[in-house]
């Protein structure tokens, strides 16, 4: 078993990207607040091409995307489901 699988013990994202990931290729987004041994917010995106990447939580495009997805989820099924994982 790889160390990377013990995700409750430390940060999962050793590096992040700030480049834009298009909404059309996003399958799932997970926002994890600080906690469980990781002092920072982590944003993980799963793409439709079977990749999983860490994204800079402060990237402006991500903030816009999260607002867009959350506003859509109020009226319909979101294109990219957002899960907020509690770090308790």
């Amino acid at each position: 078993i790889l160390e990377a699988h013990y995700t409750n013990l430390k940060c999962r994202c050793s590096g992040v990207i700030s480049t834009v990931v298009g909404l059309n290729i996003i399958d799932r987004i997970q926002v994890t607040p600080p906690g469980n041994g990781c002092p920072k917010t982590e944003v993980v995106i799963w793409t439709k091409m079977k990749k999983v990447i860490c994204v800079n939580p402060r990237a402006k495009w991500l903030q816009r995307l999260l607002r867009h997805v959350q506003s859509k989820s109020l009226s319909s099924t979101p294109q990219a489901p957002v899960s907020k994982r509690r770090a308790a």
Partner: antibody, heavy 122, light 107 residues
């Protein structure tokens, strides 16, 4: 505990179809993010990626073999399959199946089967 | 397709030696590179993931690094149990591609 095991014919003749089965436990191909890949290794040589199949039935193939490869799965039986048509001597190799899980950090092929030696000979 | 050029193809070193194996990527792969160790008669197993992260249970004498398109696996002080084949794998994009492998032998 994750385990994988390959099965299939040990020997077959040129132009025949090779059918391999990967039986696994410790994970399910119905779970989001789970995948199984096939990799082969001719004796004394390097590894060659062949194909991947994912929980949602998304499939990826090595372009150099795409016309001869078919990957599939039986989720309820915890099995993945690979078919290679029209085999020839260069297909002689040890064939491995390996698990991938879309977690972060993403480490494809984190668990491997023991491999099965396949010989193509007339 | 992304080509991974691995060198050397074989390497003979003495116990305690520092050895380095290199893979060069033909296109940008970022940090999406794994090093696998394959002991004789066994299946491959990841030792380094994301270019420089040590997999669980792997001794700290193993390390990974990157300089541009060159990716290196270093063993700081060779031990007998390190005798194995080593393979790099890029998974930046499909098709995934492996290096040709390096056979590490103990003198």
């Amino acid at each position: 505990q994750v385990t994988l095991k390959e099965s299939g014919p040990g020997i077959l003749q040129p132009s025949q179809t090779l059918s391999l089965t990967c039986s696994f436990s410790g994970f399910s191909l119905s779970t989001y993010g789970m995948g199984v890949g096939w990799i082969r290794q001719p004796s004394g040589k390097g590894l060659e990626w062949l194909a991947n199949i994912w929980w949602d039935d998304d499939k990826y193939y090595n372009p150099s073999l795409i016309n001869r490869l078919t990957i599939s799965k039986n989720t309820s039986n915890n099995q993945a399959f690979l078919k290679i048509t029209n085999v020839d001597a260069p297909d002689t190799a040890t064939y491995y199946c390996a698990r991938s899980e879309l977690v972060m950090p993403y480490v494809p092929f984190d668990f491997w089967g023991q491999g099965i030696m396949v010989t193509v000979s007339s | 397709d992304i080509q991974m050029t691995q060198s050397p193809s074989s390497l003979s070193a003495s116990l305690g030696d520092r050895i380095t194996i290199t893979c060069q990527a033909s296109q940008d792969i970022g940090i999406d590179l794994i090093w696998f160790q394959q002991k004789p008669g066994k299946s491959p197993w990841p030792v380094i993931y994301y270019t420089a992260n040590l997999a669980s249970g792997v001794p700290s004498r193993f390390s990974g690094s990157r300089s541009g398109s060159h990716y290196s696996l270093t063993i700081s002080s060779l031990e007998s149990e390190d005798m194995a084949d080593y393979h790099c794998l890029q998974y930046k994009q499909y098709p995934f591609t492996f290096g040709s492998g390096t056979k590490l032998e103990i003198k």
